[in-house]
C-alpha cells in the first residue's frame, strides 16, 4: 500500500517515515530507494543511514531535514522534477530475520498551478487537486477535496509514518490571491 | 572490475558435503549483500541463498534449508556456501552474485555433481 | 512463493527483427522485476531492472516494460550476439523467483 503525496516542479518534496527508538536514542539503520520496496533492503537507493548518521547519498538533493536521532527519518527532496515522480521506500531496518519496516511512499510531481483571479481560483484548483491523498488497502482512505483548502496532518499509525500535507493555503496566500 | 570467482565444486556421492568460496573483489563487499544462485542442468535460475552486509541475517529456498549454510568473511572479501546432506536434485552449476535484490554481478560458476 | 511464467518457450527469429518476450508473474511484483541474458558458458549478465533500466552497459535495442504481473523484454533489432536464453526475476516477494526462461534461437 502507498500513501501519496503531490509536489511542484522546483519545489522541495516533503516524503514522511518515521520509527521510535527503543528504547530512545538506540538507532537502526535505515536506507530509502526509488521503487516500491523489494525483498531486502533498498534497491535504487537514494539515502542510506547507519546507526549514527547519514553515509550515503546519492545527489545532494536528498536530505533528512528531521530529528534523525529521534527516529524522524522522512526524506527532503529538494528542487523536485518531473523525473522525481513515482514510489519511493522507506525501509527501518530492525535487527532480526524479517524484521525490517517497510514503507512506500507515491511522489506526485506537478507542473506549478497557475494562479488566477479569486472567481477561478476555487474551480481549478478542484480540478487540478481532486484527490490530495489516498492510503492503500491496509490503511485509511482519505480523499481531500480542496473547497476551503485546509491544512491536513494525517498520521497512519499502521505505517507508523506521518504524512504531513501542507495545502497551497500559504503559498496562496502570500501570493495575495483571495480564497474563499 | 568487479569479479567474483567461485571454487570448491565437483563430484560427491549422495549425503556428502561440500563447500564453495567466492572471492570478490573490484568493490566494497562490505556493503553488498551476497548470494548464491544455481542452475541445474537444462532448467532455470534459481536462487539459493544469500546473506546481509554484517552476516546477521540469512535467507533460503526451502529446497536447501536445514542443509545448506552460507557465510561471508569481509576481511577476505569472501563467500561461502557449506553444502551438507547432499542430494542427486543438488546437482547444478552454482553462481556467486551480488545482491541488489536483483543480481548485477555474477561469477562464472562452478559445478557441484551429486551422483553415486 | 510468486511463480514467474515466461512465453513463449522458444522463439525463432530472423537477425534484424524484432524479439518480444513475455514474463507474467503469479501475483503483483510491483515494478520490481529484472531481465537477464544467459549464454551457453557463460555466467548471466543482467540487462534490465526496476522493470524498465537498462543495466550499465546494455545497449539501446534492450527495453523493459510493465508493472504488477505482466512484463515484457523487448530487443527492437536482433543481432548475432542476442541469440541466447533470457530469464525473468521479480525481487517483489520472497523467495526470490526466476522464470522458466525463453530461448531465442535463429529462424
Known amino acids: 500500500s502507498e500513501v501519496e503525496y503531490i509536489a511542484e516542479v522546483g519545489q522541495n518534496a516533503y516524503l514522511p517515515c518515521s520509527y521510535t527508538p527503543a528504547p530512545p536514542g538506540n538507532l537502526v539503520p535505515v536506507c530509502w530507494g526509488k521503487g516500491a520496496c523489494p525483498v531486502f533492503d533498498c534497491s535504487n537507493v537514494v539515502l542510506r543511514t547507519d546507526n549514527r548518521d547519514v553515509n550515503d547519498r546519492t545527489s545532494g538533493r536528498y536530505w533528512l531535514k528531521g530529528d534523525f536521532h529521534k527516529g524522524d527519518v522522512s526524506l527532503t527532496i529538494e528542487n523536485v522534477t518531473l523525473a522525481d515522480s513515482g514510489v519511493y521506500c522507506c525501509r527501518i531496518q530492525i535487527p532480526g530475520i524479517m524484521n525490517d519496516e517497510k514503507h512506500n511512499v507515491k511522489l506526485v510531481v506537478i507542473k506549478p498551478a497557475k494562479v488566477t483571479p479569486a472567481p477561478t481560483l476555487q474551480r481549478d484548483l478542484t480540478s487540478a487537486f481532486p484527490r490530495m491523498l489516498t492510503t492503500g488497502e491496509h490503511g485509511p482512505a482519505e480523499t481531500q477535496t480542496p473547497g476551503s483548502l485546509p491544512d491536513v496532518n494525517l498520521t497512519v499509525s499502521n505505517f507508523f509514518c506521518e504524512l504531513q500535507i501542507f495545502t497551497l493555503t500559504n503559498e496562496l496566500r502570500d501570493s495575495g490571491a483571495t480564497i474563499r | 572490475e568487479v569479479q567474483l570467482v567461485e571454487s570448491g565444486g565437483g563430484l560427491v556421492q549422495p549425503g556428502g558435503s561440500l563447500r564453495l568460496s567466492c572471492a570478490a573483489s573490484?568493490?566494497?563487499?562490505?556493503?553488498?549483500?551476497m548470494s548464491w544462485v544455481r542452475q541445474a542442468p537444462g532448467k532455470g535460475l534459481e536462487w539459493v541463498a544469500n546473506?546481509?552486509?554484517?552476516?546477521?541475517?540469512?535467507y533460503y529456498v526451502d529446497s536447501v534449508k536445514g542443509r545448506f549454510t552460507i557465510s561471508r568473511d569481509s576481511a577476505k572479501n569472501s563467500l561461502y556456501l557449506q553444502m551438507n546432506s547432499l542430494r542427486a536434485e543438488d546437482t547444478a552449476m552454482y553462481f556467486c552474485?551480488?545482491?541488489?535484490?536483483?543480481?548485477?554481478?555474477w561469477g562464472q560458476g562452478t559445478l557441484v555433481t551429486v551422483s553415486s | 512463493e510468486t511463480v514467474m511464467t515466461q512465453s513463449p518457450a522458444t522463439l525463432s527469429v530472423s537477425p534484424g527483427e524484432r524479439a518480444t518476450l513475455s514474463c507474467r508473474a503469479s501475483?503483483?511484483?510491483?515494478?520490481?522485476l529484472a531481465w537477464y541474458q544467459r549464454k551457453p558458458g557463460q555466467a548471466p549478465r543482467l540487462l534490465i531492472y526496476?522493470?524498465?533500466t537498462r543495466a550499465t552497459g546494455i545497449p539501446a535495442r534492450f527495453s523493459g516494460s510493465g508493472s504488477g504481473t505482466e512484463f515484457t523484454l523487448t530487443i527492437s533489432s536482433l543481432q548475432s550476439e542476442d541469440f541466447a536464453v533470457y530469464y525473468c526475476?521479480?525481487?517483489?516477494?520472497?523467495?526470490?523467483?526466476f522464470g522458466g526462461g525463453t530461448k531465442v534461437e535463429i529462424k
Open positions: 552474485a551480488r545482491d541488489s535484490n536483483f543480481f548485477d554481478y
Open positions: 573490484g568493490f566494497t563487499f562490505s556493503s553488498y549483500w
Open positions: 546473506i546481509k552486509q554484517d552476516g546477521s541475517e540469512k
Open positions: 501475483q503483483s511484483v510491483s515494478s520490481n
Open positions: 526496476f522493470s524498465s
Open positions: 526475476q521479480q525481487y517483489n516477494n520472497w523467495p526470490l523467483t
